[in-house]
């Protein structure tokens, strides 16, 4: 995840719990990886300017057959206004960077991380 | 100097709602993840809820069952806390926080 | 959540000595970003509570530097190298690395 500035709105406002149940999961994946995360597929990595679910969504869409990350796909699915499906490209990716989903996953779960640290414990 | 202020405590009665609000000044509000944190008459202090620099993104501890809403206005350096459905336990001293904290406000929940 | 554990609960001191409070946590704070996430406040008598120390070591301004936060992992100590009459009041830990953020539940420093 390259850039971790300007939080954009996402869109439709996602529940109270959303945000809470994402770190929650991506915390679970993240603990209970053994193999490496779907095979080592490698994923776009994003640009966080901009809606962070969708972004997030349209890098991860792209690897099936993972179970370890349906429920994530699942959630940002929930949370992204907008239809997303595989093989689709906007502007929210690195278009020259590409990560394994294991770091991908770690990276999401660090940002989201800090966007309520800033000031707090630093 | 950063400076805190949170305004709307007040004695209430269960089931009832209040909106805390917290006024910053002495720091550029709009680039600061926000928190409120409160104090209960036993001196425990729990995190109640947290809001990104933009406002786009908040989390609840799971604790909060969902009955509180943080929220902020940039352009007028504000956070707020709307409270509902308010139980005894919630009763407490609110702190708004950001490194610094504020000198709290007292909301106290009873028939 | 991560239980954040302080010990002791009371801590009285003569002026001028020094003092040591511990806080030991659930599970290790040590984030995958290499960064501790764990704070210090003092809540002086009647007063709310005020940051000390961030990210474990890290003094906040205008903090006398007789204040010094140590630790990694799990184990984390905040030590008074001569308590001063202001420094009393109760000190908390407070983690940022697993959310929800957790808090210790207070070691109150008393003046001898």
């Known amino acids: 995840l390259t850039c971790l500035g300007g939080f954009a709105s996402p869109g439709p406002v996602p529940p109270s719990t959303a945000l809470r149940e994402l770190i929650e999961e991506l915390v679970n994946i993240t603990q209970n990886q053994k193999a490496p995360l779907c095979n080592g597929s490698m994923v776009w990595s994003i640009n966080l300017t901009a809606g962070m679910y969708c972004a997030a969504l349209e890098s991860l869409i792209n690897v099936s057959g993972c179970s370890a990350i349906e429920k994530t796909q699942r959630m940002l699915s929930g949370f992204c206004p907008h239809k997303v499906s595989a093989g689709q490209f906007s502007s929210l990716h690195v278009r020259d960077t590409k990560i394994e989903v294991a770091q991908f996953v770690k990276d999401l779960l660090l940002h989201l991380k800090k966007l309520f640290r800033e000031g707090q414990f630093n | 100097e950063v400076q805190l202020v949170e305004s709307g405590g007040g004695l209430v009665k269960p089931g009832g709602s209040l909106k805390l609000s917290c006024a910053a000044s002495g720091f550029t509000f709009s680039t600061y993840a926000m928190s409120w944190v409160r104090q209960t008459p036993e001196k425990r202090l729990e995190w109640v809820a947290g809001?990104?620099?933009?406002?786009?993104?908040?989390y609840y501890p799971e604790t909060m069952k969902g009955r509180f809403t943080i929220s902020r206005d940039n352009a007028r350096n504000t956070l707020y806390l709307q409270m509902s459905s308010l139980r005894s336990e919630d009763t407490a001293i609110y702190y708004c926080t950001r490194g610094s904290w504020g000198q709290g406000t007292s909301v106290t929940v009873s028939s | 959540d991560v239980v954040l554990t302080q010990t002791p609960l009371t801590l009285s001191v003569t002026i001028g000595q020094p003092a040591s409070i511990s806080c030991k946590s659930s599970?290790?704070?040590?984030?995958?970003?290499?960064?501790?996430?764990l704070n210090w406040l003092l809540q002086r008598p009647g007063q709310s509570p005020k940051r000390l120390i961030y990210l474990v070591s890290k003094l906040d301004s205008g903090v006398p530097d007789r204040f010094t936060g140590s630790g990694s992992g799990t184990d984390f100590t905040l030590k008074i190298s001569r308590v001063e009459a202001e420094d009393l009041g109760v000190y908390y830990c407070w983690q940022g690395t697993h959310f929800p953020w957790t808090f210790g539940g207070g070691t109150k420093l008393e003046i001898k």
């Open positions: 809001i990104s620099s933009g406002g786009s993104y908040t």
């Open positions: 599970q290790s704070l040590l984030d995958s970003d290499g960064e501790t996430y």
